[in-house]
């Protein structure tokens, strides 16, 4: 009896949908695997007789529930199927946005770039897919624990009237208010303000 794949899960970030599993212990030799998806009542092969422990399902529609399954094989024997269901638009992880930061005196000017949908030629982004897309920004004075959060209305934001000659750190994530779903934070970007622009009287 061939044991089934273990720890079967979907690793999906920005609609790059990778089904992953672990090979079970099997004394007779090396196992291969077949992974399939349900397409209108029929299971279709996606990865056949692969020695890998992952399979790319990124071509599946972003919308609706999908049933995926994988089994282990050895010679003419095979394990039972292990099934999972997956809805990309609900389940994919929203990766960190890009962010450009520029210091102008005592202000930080930030521009946000929504993460791209993976493995597509065009520049479609996660913002295209989710109507309610917005950004959360958090910033703090470097070396302190207190963080401030804002929700910009646009793809840019300006933090004004900051302390001069002080390093501030900023990070951004995507947020979907209608789903109460937050994406991953970008890596912090830290920049030092310069002087304030007030002219002494």
């Amino acid at each position: 009896m061939v044991p089934p794949p273990e720890n079967v899960r979907m690793n999906s970030v920005n609609f790059k949908n990778i089904l992953q599993w672990e090979s079970p212990a099997f004394a007779k030799g090396n196992l291969t695997f077949t992974a399939q998806y349900l397409s209108y009542r029929i299971f279709q092969d996606k990865c056949m007789n692969t020695t890998l422990t992952e399979c790319d399902f990124s071509s599946l529609s972003k919308y609706g529930d999908h049933t995926l399954r994988v089994r282990a094989e050895f010679a003419d024997e095979h394990s039972d199927w292990v099934n999972i269901t997956f809805c990309p638009v609900d389940d994919t992880i929203i990766g960190p946005p890009g962010m450009q930061v520029e210091v102008l005196a005592d202000s930080l000017h930030m521009r946000f770039l929504a993460p791209k949908i993976e493995n597509e030629y065009e520049t479609w982004t996660m913002k295209n897919v989710y109507n309610s897309w917005t950004y959360n920004v958090q910033y703090w004075k470097n070396g302190t624990d207190e963080k401030f959060q804002i929700t910009p209305q646009y793809d840019f934001e300006v933090l004004r009237n900051l302390e001069p000659w002080t390093t501030y750190c900023v990070q951004v994530r995507g947020f979907l208010p209608d789903r109460n779903k937050a994406g991953e934070w970008s890596e912090p970007v830290c920049e030092q303000t310069t002087h304030d622009e007030t002219v002494p009287s």
Epitope: S39, S59, S61, K62, Y63, N119, E120, Y121, W124
Partner: nanobody, 126 residues
Framework: QVQLQESGGGSVQAGGSLRLSCAAS????????MGWFRQAPGKEREGVAT???????NYADSVKGRFTISKDNAKNTLYLQMNSLKPEDTAMYYC????????????????????WGQGTQVTVSS
Amino acid sequence: QVQLQESGGGSVQAGGSLRLSCAASGYTYSSGCMGWFRQAPGKEREGVATINSDGSTNYADSVKGRFTISKDNAKNTLYLQMNSLKPEDTAMYYCAAEPYCSGGYPRWSVAEFGYWGQGTQVTVSS
């Protein structure tokens, strides 16, 4: 909400032609992948022709040289020109769309398209 509405089906003699149309609302054809599928009685739904946002096309072997898929982005309409029709082309024809898709993957199965029309019947008699 994306809605697709097919039209242009009907009955025709073998060797004849039909032009199917698919009008979209809530969706822009230039922003995704589109396809025509068909389903004959007692058979599975199968891909007939697909077109990507860049205009590149794919056809099932059984219709190559006879069918042409095209789209008019300005009218937000997808077309399937069917020539030299055969009795085996008899089926319900469905329009399908997958928004924000460009052709990074070849899409050819039902599960790869998220939105569907109600279908239009094509009957070819010998």
